[in-house]
Amino acid sequence: IWELKKDVYVVELDWYPDAPGEMVVLTCDTPEEDGITWTLDQSSEVLGSGKTLTIQVKEFGDAGQYTCHKGGEVLSHSLLLLHKKEDGIWSTDILKDQKEPKNKTFLRCEAKNYSGRFTCWWLTTISTDLTFSVKSSRGSSDPQGVTCGAATLSAERVRGDNKEYEYSVECQEDSACPAAEESLPIEVMVDAVHKLKYENYTSSFFIRDIIKPDPPKNLQLKPLKNSRQVEVSWEYPDTWSTPHSYFSLTFCVQVQGKSKREKKDRVFTDKTSATVICRKNASISVRAQDRYYSSSWSEWASVPCS
Amino acid sequence: RNLPVATPDPGMFPCLHHSQNLLRAVSNMLQKARQTLEFYPCTSEEIDHEDITKDKTSTVEACLPLELTKNESCLNSRETSFITNGSCLASRKTSFMMALCLSSIYEDLKMYQVEFKTMNAKLLMDPKRQIFLDQNMLAVIDELMQALNFNSETVPQKSSLEEPDFYKTKIKLCILLHAFRIRAVTIDRVMSYLNAS
């Protein structure tokens, strides 16, 4: 058993049929010595008396808010949560496996630049009685500071018969140099509590590997005389690291109709303009990627050919 | 400890082309190592990230773009003194700081070159003959060093009398290649910045 936060404790249980469970001793936070009784949740049934209560925690029915009273007055609470271990593996029931970039990916993180700011998100089908707490650091043995905000519900989607909820959190490394060469990864830890179930999820990464620039901005077209060719120009996104001559981007320019199966014109360039062939009912799209370290491409920025 | 935005002569930078070749060569070599050593811990997640130049050179700090010198977190206290005569410095206006930066890059290359050559000598003794260093990568390191053209004491190649542990050597190769790729990215960024300045 360990303390998650004040008056909230996590009991780690090997979860299998007829498991013996864990013996837990609860102590009432009071100077009083006698006349103390214990109850669980809203029940008025007295579970025991005395300053300490010894319980055998085997299942979710044994978890919950234990309260010690004296003469009708509440003295203190202890909330017990369960953390299940099945076949030596901690349970991952609360969050959905996003399977990208590999199986057992519960947390996904992205950074728009090298400033040390990044966003992580996760998915769940659970809509109520759910709380998250996020901590992060650079390295684990001698951790350096990363400050994370509160996790918030950022999107709701309907997937088949059930709803899917996306939560996200923003974090900022306390003293980040955009030009630094990372040798210690960022560690992100998410504590998830659903009703009386506790789970924790972790992710470890280098900022350089989670870079995904914003799309290029200010796309403009200029038709070329006596030709089907069009000059398309754009600018670096505002959120990208500066100076741009140091943090350079490379671009992919594509002309395509509405369907992905349609024919297309595609060219890669390090410049902020390119010449392509425009077709009726097609769109010109441009996306960006770090020129020197190939992490993710940005989403497309698009303008219609016409 | 930073690069002032000098205005060098147009086309001053023969090093830009070489640095692009360097990044390409080390990335290809790393990819080859990952594929060939698929049953060894050779991915970014599996290896320890070591920097053989740590406390010996200060490339990131010495080559910091002017715009980042206002960022307290970028101004590390590591200082190293270097020789200052390089052929990439085609402009008389080139500052002492730029020379310091390029000479730091030269020292990095020299250190990695020695490590890679020592390692290759060991890998050539491996009866499995599983992986060797790409001669193109070694040649590209040499070309960039020549373009930088700094006078420097030659570092003797490390020779070892004991029987090499080939497993450890291959893991060390992965560690070195990952670190060298990161440094090659920095070098490319620096050359691009200097070329644009």
Epitope: R261, K263, V267, F268 | -
Partner: antibody
Framework: QVQLVQSGAEVKKPGSSVKVSCKAS????????LHWVRQAPGQGLEWMGW????????EYAPKFQGRVTITADESTSTAYMELSSLRSEDTAVYYC???????????LGQGTLVTVSS | DIVMTQSPLSLPVTPGEPASISCRAS??????LHWYQQKPGQAPRLLIA???QSISGVPSRFSGSGSGTDFTLTISSLQPEDFATYLC?????????FGQGTKVEIK
């Protein structure tokens, strides 16, 4: 299986014209760009131009501008390349090529040898 | 027009050995470079698109690298069927242009 089948070899006199055909099978004809490239004996490839069969749009290499005409007939899934004012240096194997991507070729025809000789 | 220069023009290789072919552009073309294989009397066949993207059905021993002006096609271990002429093509701008070809011959 996508195939491009070209018309047979031709022998032409200098100053005349030649029209080579390229019949596509497999896949929708208008879903692809169609190009013509040529290869003189012992030489590399030379790009001549492309057509978008969907709308008839064409683009020609400046070297052939005014001398080459590329057309397409959607009803027969056939593209044509006509080269006029032939000279001896036009002796080459002419290939049609296609792709959904405009700027390179994933399938090429078997080639048509055009010999220009007096 | 962008001029593509291949080297060497002829490359004698022992079967089972690796081979590398170089292609250089007269100006920077990013990764807009494609490789083809051509056997005598046959049409060219696409091997690699955009400098390094493998093409379905092409053996994995063929790989490409490079960007800007310098590109390389590598055959990790030459098989008897790989003895042919290899061509590079730029797609950075029209007119599309090709290298003059590198003939890989049996040593």
């Amino acid at each position: 299986q996508v195939q491009l089948v070209q018309s047979g070899a031709e022998v032409k006199k200098p100053g005349s014209s030649v029209k080579v055909s390229c019949k596509a099978s497999g896949g929708t004809f208008s879903d692809y760009y169609l190009h013509w490239v040529r290869q003189a004996p012992g030489q590399g490839l030379e790009w001549m131009g492309w057509i978008d069969p969907e709308n008839g749009d064409t683009e020609y290499a400046p070297k052939f501008q005014g001398r080459v005409t590329i057309t397409a007939d959607e009803s027969t899934s056939t593209a044509y390349m006509e080269l006029s004012s032939l000279r001896s240096e036009d002796t080459a194997v002419y290939y049609c090529a296609r792709n959904k991507e405009l700027r390179y070729f994933d399938v090429l025809g078997q080639g048509t040898l055009v010999t220009v000789s007096s | 027009d962008i001029v593509m220069t291949q080297s060497p023009l002829s490359l004698p290789v022992t079967p089972g050995e690796p081979a590398s072919i170089s292609c250089r552009a007269s100006q920077s073309i990013s990764i807009n470079l494609h490789w083809y294989q051509q056997k005598p009397g046959q049409a060219p066949r696409l091997l690699i698109a955009f400098a390094s993207q493998s093409i379905s059905g092409v053996p994995s021993r063929f790989s490409g690298s490079g960007s800007g002006t310098d590109f390389t096609l590598t055959i990790s271990s030459l098989q008897p069927e790989d003895f042919a002429t290899y061509l590079c093509q730029q797609s950075n701008s029209f007119p599309l242009t090709f290298g003059q070809g590198t003939k890989v011959e049996i040593k």
